[in-house]
Interface confidence: medium
Amino acid sequence: AITEAREEAKPYPLFPGPFPGSLQTDHTPLLSLPHASGYQPALMFSPTQPGRPHTGNVAIPQVTSVESKPLPPLAFKHTVGHIILSEHKGVKFNCSISVPNIYQDTTISWWKDGKELLGAHHAITQFYPDDEVTAIIASFSITSVQRSDNGSYICKMKINNEEIVSDPIYIEVQGLPHFTKQPESMNVTRNTAFNLTCQAVGPPEPVNIFWVQNSSRVNEQPEKSPSVLTVPGLTEMAVFSCEAHNDKGLTVSKGVQINIKAIPSPPTEVSIRNSTAHSILISWVPGFDGYSPFRNCSIQVKEADPLSNGSVMIFNTSALPHLYQIKQLQALANYSIGVSCMNEIGWSAVSPWILASTTEGAPSVAPLNVTVFLNESSDNVDIRWMKPPTKQQDGELVGYRISHVWQSAGISKELLEEVGQNGSRARISVQVHNATCTVRIAAVTRGGVGPFSDPVKIFIPAHGWVDYAPSSTPAPGNADPVLII
């Protein structure tokens, strides 16, 4: 078993013979360079001291010395194989190799998990030359280890296009459990089961999970990470979190609130944005959604007139954009308006009712029973009518507009007359003899001019003709009445 900050295998002396396991002060390095880019300067080396057999890559030199002895194989010395330490601690490890001085252009580089470590790493290479060999120690240090420093580190050296690779040094950074998945806030239906997930990792493993609901542990016995808690259902809001334990200690997840879906609160601040004769544009501020998105809203409209039958008109609309134009209303009428909205659970109560009024509108119908006749003696045309029904006046009558069009051979002229609201008859002067006069009447309120009545035509003879019967609004279906006298 490996315990924190102890080596799995003891390092062997770096240099048997003249190089003791711990370097002595009288062996001052010839050169000490920071390993900034993975590049090492070319140096001359002399033959190595025999080292311990090695499992890494070995370069067997083909060159022989002056005495023609074959050179021993080149290999990195064995060193610590596995370093375990806590997060934020410092660590330093090294590779060492003795290289004959006959070799030039050697470089040592550090690699982690198959990728070369370039740039601002704390790597230093020291050189200890002797008559025949130069001992090289490549050190790598990390001042404050993080989880991301976990991995397998190796040294590589290139000599004459041969690559020598050291045994790996495994760095294991241990710390408190680290959450990879924490429970999420949820909005749930009352008494309906739901799942929460919690996952945490070491090292060290294993990581055990305890669930906490409203500050009380759900499970007295721990579960292994990852853990899923199935809650059979809640009747009120609860806060859940999970605790992750390993040999280093405890980490607590964020607390998440599980809300119970409910019917929404009623909308507030229903207000009138615009009124016309037959429509009212309202807006409202939605109430609390009950932890479930609004689906739609219902606008309830009832006549405020105490004599009305009290029936309620209902208009359904989407929940957004909190605006609705209520149409098909009567002009100059008072209404009570309330709004209710729904989510998946149900409908809210109705908002406080507000009073709203429509404005005056132009009359929606024309005057009825229009009658036209010629008073030859006074050379006038008399017109009579009945005012439109009060409900359809859509406001207070201020008068009538009479259109009379005179047509004879090659001539057509239209004249407009305004008459006061009290009358139901008018007299207009004959404009052209031996012509047809076409009369139409519209009721007028402050809201505008209503529709004109169907045209009534009367023929005005030349002077000296006798006065005959009147012309009147035709029965439905007769579109073009003409009374020829």
């Epitope: 294993p206 055990n208 759900v218 007295e220 016995q221 579960e223 292994k224 899923v228 809650v231």
Partner: antibody, heavy 123, light 107 residues
């Protein structure tokens, strides 16, 4: 098909110890809790405890602490329960049972059971 | 520890009839599981997490309940359903106790 194969019947003397085995197959043994349950003749079921083979973690029913020791061997996919200082009260059928559901569900029910090992304690 | 009381202790039913047995907990539990055991055999999981049918179990079996009161129902009794039925709780605190069992016989 998940299977739990338990060792055969045991006849032991009072005061002795016995080790019962439960060999699992066709599932990831190291990642599911293995539970042990006792059933006395003509009686109901009693939960003894459980072990997580992945790391040897154990939980016990307080009544069986000191009586039962749970172990597991991942290499052979086998769980063991050792019972010591046996008395006639320990005569029963002992079942191993796998924790059901997906291995990381916190609910604890038993979806697969061994065939049972009969232990008789008699002088 | 939580105590589970099953009732009735023994009951008999004719084929085709509906059978309901109950399991009452001494305090509220999160889930109830149900097992069937026939003489000389191991228990068999029927219902887990209160109402979920275990694999291979006929749909005539169903479970329900919450809090301290749970029940197991067989919609139409069959001869092969004669057995002893045990409830087992999962709650906040161990141990995972079993009820005393309900023995169901065929009439």
């Amino acid at each position: 098909q998940v299977q739990l194969q338990q060792s055969g019947p045991e006849l032991v003397k009072p005061g002795a110890s016995v080790k019962i085995s439960c060999k699992a197959s066709d599932y990831e043994f190291s990642r599911s809790w293995m539970n042990w349950v006792k059933q006395r003749p003509g009686k109901g079921l009693e939960w003894i405890g459980r072990i997580y083979p992945g790391d040897g973690d154990t939980n016990y029913n307080g009544k069986f602490k000191g009586k039962a020791t749970l172990t597991a061997d991942k290499s052979s996919n086998t769980a063991y329960m050792q019972l010591n200082s046996l008395t006639s009260e320990d005569s029963a059928v002992y079942f191993c049972a796998r924790k059901g559901g997906y291995y990381y569900s916190i609910s604890n029910y038993f979806d697969y059971w061994g065939q049972g090992t009969t232990l008789t304690v008699s002088s | 520890q939580i105590v589970l009381t099953q009732s009735p202790a023994i009951m008999s039913a004719s084929p085709g009839v509906k059978v309901t047995m109950t399991c009452s907990a001494s305090s509220s539990v999160s889930y109830m599981h149900w097992y069937q055991q026939k003489p000389g055999s191991s228990p068999r999981l029927l219902i887990y997490d209160t109402s979920n049918l275990a694999s291979g179990v006929p749909v005539r079996f169903s479970g329900s309940g919450s809090g301290t009161s749970y029940s197991l129902t067989i919609s139409r009794m069959e001869a092969e359903d004669a057995a002893t039925y045990y409830c087992q709780q999962w709650s906040s605190y161990p141990p995972y106790t079993f009820g005393g069992g309900t023995k169901l016989e065929i009439k």
